[in-house]
């Protein structure tokens, strides 16, 4: 199955990495430091 | 407000089938894997099933498997449990949980909003 | 199947005291990745349960920060700093880091 990291989440994370849980098709992100919530957006 | 709703549940002969019907409302339903954990009276939670967000993939115990099914409908914001050839151990409340916000890389927060349960009896 | 083994399973506590509740596991609950998906949920009576503590150590929102969690690998604590009267009701660990998920037996903690 196509990760959708790399596709329409491609943009998804604004400070952090898109991850991809293929066993419960979840799409998150993974934080850059000192930034939290759904995008990582908030500092 | 995050809601969780189920339905469904009843009294039904050993051998026979029921389908309890989670309403959720109050989150984004299509984001979130679900769950049905049940409650045997007087015992502890035992996990039934999980659902991912898109249905693609479902998992479940070796009490339940071959027996229940789990499936989703996203556009009505609704869960289902399918439950065929009932025994007297399924006798429990059914409860709906969320499984857990997504955020900050925690996908699996355990689950964090539950249901208020139906009740399941199978007897004869 | 990964077995959860609460002790003690009654815990009567007098008000204002610690309480503390252990959970084992049959086999370590550390992902690939080094995540340990070890939960704690509080079942008042009458309730359906609400999740108190995730990923071992994490207070969930709302959850009073007299209770806490800690351990790592197969052993776990659940402690509450001075137990209050709403805080009776049974407490369960519960492990997702391996399928099928699986619950402890529950503890159920009582006022003296």
């Known amino acids: 199955k196509k990760n959708p990291c790399t596709a329409e989440f491609q943009n998804f994370c604004i400070h952090g990495e898109c991850r991809y849980i293929e066993h419960l098709e979840v799409v998150t992100c993974n934080c850059h430091q000192d930034y939290f919530g759904e995008r990582c957006g908030e500092k | 407000e995050v809601q969780l709703v189920e339905s469904g549940g009843g009294l039904v002969k050993p051998g026979g089938s029921l389908r309890l019907s989670c309403a959720a409302s109050?989150?984004?339903?299509?984001?979130?894997?679900m769950s049905w954990v049940r409650q045997a009276p007087e015992k502890g939670l035992e996990w039934v099933s999980t659902?991912?967000?898109?249905?693609?993939?479902?998992y479940y115990p070796d009490s339940v498997k071959g027996r229940f099914t789990i499936s989703r409908d996203n556009a009505k914001n609704s869960l289902y449990l399918q439950m065929n050839s009932l025994r007297a151990e399924d006798t429990a409340v059914y409860y709906c949980a969320r499984q857990g916000p997504i955020y900050y890389g925690n996908y699996y927060y355990g689950m964090d909003v539950w249901g208020q349960g139906t009740t399941v009896t199978v007897s004869s | 199947d990964v077995v959860m083994t609460q002790s003690p399973l009654s815990l009567p506590v007098t008000l204002g005291d610690p309480a503390s509740i252990s959970c084992r596991s049959s086999?370590?609950?550390?992902?690939?990745?080094?995540?340990?998906?070890l939960h704690w949920y509080q079942q008042r009576p009458g309730q359906s349960p609400k999740l108190l503590i995730y990923k071992v150590s994490n207070r969930f929102d709302g959850v009073p920060d007299r209770f806490s969690g800690s351990g790592s690998g197969t052993d776990f604590t659940l402690k509450i700093s001075r137990v209050e009267a709403e805080d009776v009701g049974v407490y369960y660990c519960s492990q997702s880091t391996h399928v099928p998920y699986t619950f402890g037996q529950g503890t159920k903690l009582e006022i003296k």
């Open positions: 086999q370590s609950l550390v992902n690939q990745e080094g995540e340990t998906y």
């Open positions: 659902i991912s967000t898109g249905g693609t993939y479902t």
């Open positions: 109050g989150f984004t339903f299509s984001s979130y894997p």
